[in-house]
């Protein structure tokens, strides 16, 4: 069964900067990626980005940089303009499409112990699993 | 302007083959994924095959698998349905779609259909 | 495969009324259904997709809402041209599954 895995790590540099790395385990071909805080997109979460593997990638506020790391996972950068780091309490979720297969969607958050500048092992939340 | 017309429909034995053709106009058909959907008589719809951008990745219904194969090509804006080992239960008004990535892969265009009748 | 239960069959109303579709999948699909009409002699063309967004030119008195596995299609106020069947569909999962579909007749 596919997979996906989300990742969410601080930038040492600057604490108000933040970074989500998601990736889709499994065969297939990924057609669309979309990126979402507070929640699935949908069900109560922002869209904060839509990436395609050939039409390009459209991002929102406050996403910095959206791009494909590599066929199947990508980074998001996010700019937070707060002094209070709202990103640090938040769920980030990806959910990838893959035709003619379908979506996988996992959704995670920074963890609460980590150091900045310390890379957080990935700790997918799987949501939704359709074989559940 | 977008168009696709499915051609190829008839009255055939039990048993027998069709070979189905829709022919795509009006957009870049190789950026595109598409399928192939039945509307039974019961006016029920099917989705019978499917077959990604590049043609690598195929889904038949379970019904239809190992009697049917999706193919397309691309030099051609061409999907094609072959159909073998025809059954009664193949009786229906067969549509191509095409699947746009970013509504979800909702179809937003579909041909006008062609009818394929299985008769024993 | 995800089964998409859609009801009622049939709806018989009048011009000017609000009318609501629902449709309850088996399993979780998230976002990931679409709203389809078929006008009579016609092939299915899109109105909605990802629950309420709505396609090129589909008038804003259709509406799509839920997530999950429970979603509601309605016409706010029905006109005479909505005379059609209407039919959802999932895509989160293949294969890509219709619901049964709803036949709105016009008094």
């Known amino acids: 069964t596919p997979e996906v895995w989300v990742q969410v790590q601080m930038e040492a540099t600057e604490l108000s900067s933040f970074t989500v790395h998601c990736g889709f385990l499994g065969p297939g071909s990924i057609s669309l990626v979309t990126v979402s805080w507070g929640g699935p997109d949908g069900a109560g979460g922002t869209k904060l980005a839509v990436l395609h593997p050939e039409l390009g990638t459209r991002q929102w506020a406050p996403a910095r940089q959206a791009r494909w790391e590599t066929q199947s996972s990508i980074s998001l950068a996010l700019e937070d303009s707060g002094a209070s780091s709202p990103f640090a309490n938040t769920t980030f979720c990806c959910k990838f499409a893959s035709f003619p297969e379908g979506s996988w969607e996992s959704c995670g958050s920074l963890p609460p112990s980590s150091d900045p500048g310390l890379s957080a092992p990935p700790t997918p939340v799987p949501i939704l699993r359709a074989d559940l | 302007d977008v168009k696709l017309v499915e051609s190829g429909g008839g009255l055939v034995k039990l048993g027998g083959s069709l070979k189905l053709s829709c022919a795509a106009s009006?957009?870049?058909?190789?950026?595109?994924?598409m399928s192939w959907i039945r509307q039974t008589p019961e006016k029920r719809l099917e989705l019978v095959a499917a077959?990604?951008?590049?043609?690598?990745?195929?889904y038949y219904l379970d019904t239809v698998k190992g009697r049917f194969t999706i193919s397309r090509d691309n030099a051609k804006n061409t999907l094609y349905l072959q159909m073998s080992s025809l059954k009664s239960e193949d009786t229906a008004l067969y549509y191509c779609?095409?699947?746009?990535?970013?509504?979800?892969?909702?179809?937003?265009?579909w041909g006008q259909g062609t009818s394929v009748t299985v008769s024993s | 495969s995800i089964v998409m239960t859609q009801t009622p069959k049939f709806l018989l109303v009048s011009a000017g009324d609000r009318v609501t579709i629902t449709c309850k999948a088996s399993?979780?699909?998230?976002?990931?259904v679409a709203w389809y009409q078929q006008k009579p002699g016609q092939s299915p063309k899109l109105l909605m997709y990802?629950?309420?967004n709505h396609y090129t030119g589909v008038p804003d008195r259709f509406i799509g809402s839920g997530y999950g596995t429970d979603f509601t299609f309605t016409i706010s106020t029905v006109q005479a041209e909505d005379l059609a069947v209407y039919f959802c569909?999932?895509?989160?999962?293949?294969?890509?599954?219709f619901g049964g579909g709803t036949k709105l007749e016009i008094k």
């Open positions: 779609a095409r699947h746009e990535d970013y509504y979800g892969f909702a179809m937003d265009y």
């Open positions: 009006g957009f870049t058909f190789s950026s595109y994924h």
């Open positions: 077959i990604n951008s590049n043609g690598i990745n195929t």
């Open positions: 399993q979780s699909v998230t976002n990931d």
């Open positions: 990802y629950v309420s």
């Open positions: 569909q999932q895509a989160y999962r293949s294969p890509w599954t």
